[in-house]
């Protein structure tokens, strides 16, 4: 492996700068944006857009950048010190219990409930009982029992007769 970082390894805004040599570890660790060499003598820069490290480390190689899945949008690109930030596309959300996939938001609330929270990239719509104000458990209701509203629009009180 070359002791110098090539211009292609650098972010566009860094390419005008002179080439950087490997730095030395500090107390056996390398700074964010680097990994340690196998002999432990050098800190080697991660490759911009390919891999990264976010903390002081003794990794033998930087961590691979995440590629956003289909159904996700890239909020910010991978840099040498930060992984890619991906977000679910509009109309879908990622649950804490299943972060590996984006799920479709429900299109509306069950009969007798009103929407109080919109679909966001990190949460489904929120429904509460009209009278009691208690939250809905989250089961998807039958289609004919659904009060629909388009994503991103506040729900208006509905006049369904019980």
């Amino acid at each position: 492996e070359s002791a110098l970082i090539t211009q292609q390894d650098l972010a566009p805004q860094q390419r005008a700068a002179p080439q950087q040599k490997r730095s030395s570890p500090s107390e056996g660790l390398c700074p964010p944006g680097h990994h340690i060499s196998e002999d432990g003598r050098d800190c080697i820069s991660c490759k911009y857009g390919q891999d990264y490290s976010t903390h002081w480390n003794d990794l033998l190689f930087c961590l691979r950048c995440t590629r956003c899945d289909s159904g996700e949008v890239e909020l910010s690109p991978c840099t040498t010190t930060r992984n890619t930030v991906c977000q679910c596309e509009e109309g879908t959300f990622r649950e804490e219990d299943s972060p590996e996939m984006c799920r479709k938001c429900r299109t509306g609330c069950p009969r007798g409930m009103v929407k109080v929270g919109d679909c966001t990239p990190w949460s489904d719509i929120e429904c509460v009982h009209k009278e009691s104000g208690t939250k809905h458990s989250g089961e998807v209701p039958a289609v004919e029992e659904t009060v629909t509203s388009s994503p991103g629009t506040p729900a208006s009180p509905c006049s369904l007769s019980g």
Epitope: H35, L59, T66, P99, M101
Partner: nanobody, 126 residues
């Protein structure tokens, strides 16, 4: 059910050392990264260190760099944190944690971790 049980905390003088352990009940321990976090009174839980699933390489918070060393014994399903040159500001409850499914290779934020131990108290005072 995932169970994480920390031990090894206690009271120590500044400059002293402690070794924390975390025993895991989960069979996937050997294929998962694991982390240590800490929470001082009145403060938010913060990242301390995390180690790769294969124990080859780790992350450290800048505040503990060069003083703390994380290690992992997959056969024993145990995580360790060797703490030396302890300071008053290291006083906190220390938690070990396993990440949620589908997170990065080496997670380092509280939200990326879904399984937590009950914590062990470390007090550093003269």
């Amino acid at each position: 059910e995932v169970q994480l049980l920390e031990s090894g905390g206690g009271e120590v003088q500044p400059g002293g050392s402690l070794r924390l352990s975390c025993a895991a009940s989960v069979s996937t321990f050997g294929t998962s990264p694991v982390g240590w976090f800490r929470q001082a009174p009145g403060k938010e839980r913060e990242f301390v260190s995390a180690i790769r699933w294969d124990a080859v390489g780790a992350y450290y918070a800048e505040s503990v760099k060069g003083r703390f060393t994380i290690s992992k014994d997959n056969a024993k399903r145990t995580l360790y944190l060797q703490m030396s040159s302890l300071r008053a500001e290291d006083t906190a409850v220390y938690y070990c944690a396993l990440p949620r499914r589908g997170e990065s290779e080496l997670p380092s934020t509280v939200k990326e971790y879904g399984y937590w131990g009950q914590g062990t108290l470390v007090t550093v005072k003269p």
